[in-house]
């Protein structure tokens, strides 16, 4: 069957959002993707979702990200504007109204969204062929 | 393929105006940034303007400000510099570039030659 | 403004050199600091932005080190493509500024 719409948003946001790091894509997340063997596809996609969305309420106004230049101010600001259009497309992809994250292990934002884009491809690969 | 295209370089009298043209494709041109770098002959680089194209607002240079104008089309995908009292120390390469999405400017373009003479 | 200093403006090299190129800012700009390679005839390629990341592409014979005022871009192992002159730049607030290059060629 054709490759989601969708699918192919979040991987181009994805690719964007990993071509560069920032001080502030070094930061922490929940790691979803430690022990995600009984997790189906769509909670997958719901959990990253619910990661990103903590990520961005928390440091939306985070000074340590925020800068103290306008210049840096555009570049979280660009930041926050690509996790909340990954947020809102894997939201779409996954179709869950909630999903718990629980766990304990963390990781950087940065390796978390490498680790998203290497699922998404795996996704895509297969929806293609 | 990300690509930017330059044009509308050329030959003016000093006191003229000339507007360049810079086509972008292969990406979302409204989810980076764009510059304008000069380089005069034989010398180095310097920064003229940015623009934020989800907003439209430029950030000019001093020595800019007032002369020199950066808009947008963003159903061409395409960004302008309206250069106007053109000064014989305005001759140069005009590169138009791309922000990275964090940091630096990530493609360029080929470069188009004003040159302001009598 | 910020001024960007490069020194030194040029230097002659062999290959297989190492060589080390400095940049000092007028005043602190954290790490928001990137180097570009230009070729003759050329548009300026990004290698380094935040002082020490290299750009998609870029071999690992490039590194960018420093903070605050000093930075530093090193060629571990000089290649005959790499005959260049190489900028830094600020990005750290507006204007954005470029240093003065540095040319490097062939001794």
């Known amino acids: 069957h054709k490759c989601d719409i969708t699918l192919q948003e979040i991987i181009k946001t994805l690719n964007s959002l990993t071509e560069q790091k920032t001080l502030c894509t070094e930061l922490t997340v929940t790691d979803i993707f430690a022990a995600s063997k009984n997790t189906t596809e769509k909670e997958t996609f719901c959990r990253a979702a619910t990661v990103l969305r903590q990520f961005y309420s928390h440091h939306e106004k985070d000074t340590r990200c925020l800068g103290a230049t306008a210049q840096q101010f555009h570049r979280h600001k660009q930041l926050i504007r690509f996790l909340k259009r990954l947020d809102r497309n894997l939201w779409g992809l996954a179709g869950l109204n909630s999903c718990p994250v629980k766990e304990a292990n963390q990781s950087t934002l940065e390796n978390f969204l490498e680790r998203l884009k290497t699922i998404m491809r795996e996704k895509y690969s297969k929806c293609s062929s | 393929e990300v690509q930017l295209v330059e044009s509308g370089g050329g030959l003016v009298q000093p006191g003229g105006s000339l507007r360049l043209s810079c086509a972008a494709s292969?990406?979302?041109?409204?989810?980076?940034?764009m510059h304008w770098v000069r380089q005069a002959p034989g010398k180095g680089l310097e920064w003229v303007v940015w623009?934020?194209?989800?907003?439209?607002?430029?950030t000019y240079a001093d020595d800019f400000k007032g002369r020199f104008t950066f808009s947008l089309d963003n159903s061409k995908n395409t960004a302008y510099l309206q250069m106007n009292s053109l000064r014989a120390e305005d001759t140069a390469v005009y590169y138009c570039?791309?922000?990275?999405?964090?940091?630096?400017?990530?493609?360029w373009g080929q470069g188009t030659l004003v040159t302001v003479s009598s | 403004d910020i001024q960007m200093t490069q020194s030194p403006s040029s230097l002659s090299a062999s290959v297989g050199d190492r060589v080390t190129i400095t940049c000092k800012a007028s005043?602190?700009?954290?790490?928001?600091a990137a180097w570009y390679q230009q070729k003759p005839g050329k548009a300026p390629k990004l290698l380094i932005y935040?002082?020490?990341h290299r750009y998609t592409g870029v071999p690992s014979r490039f590194s960018g080190s420093g903070s605050g005022t000093d930075f530093t871009l090193t060629i571990s192992s000089l290649q005959p493509e790499d005959f260049a002159t190489y900028y830094c730049?600020?990005?750290?607030?507006?204007?954005?500024?470029f240093g003065q290059g540095t040319k490097v060629e062939i001794k």
């Open positions: 570039a791309r922000g990275g999405i964090f940091y630096g400017m990530d493609y």
């Open positions: 005043q602190s700009v954290i790490n928001d």
């Open positions: 730049q600020q990005d750290y607030t507006s204007p954005w500024t």
């Open positions: 623009i934020n194209t989800e907003t439209g607002e430029p």
């Open positions: 292969g990406y979302t041109f409204t989810d980076y940034s």
């Open positions: 935040y002082t020490s």
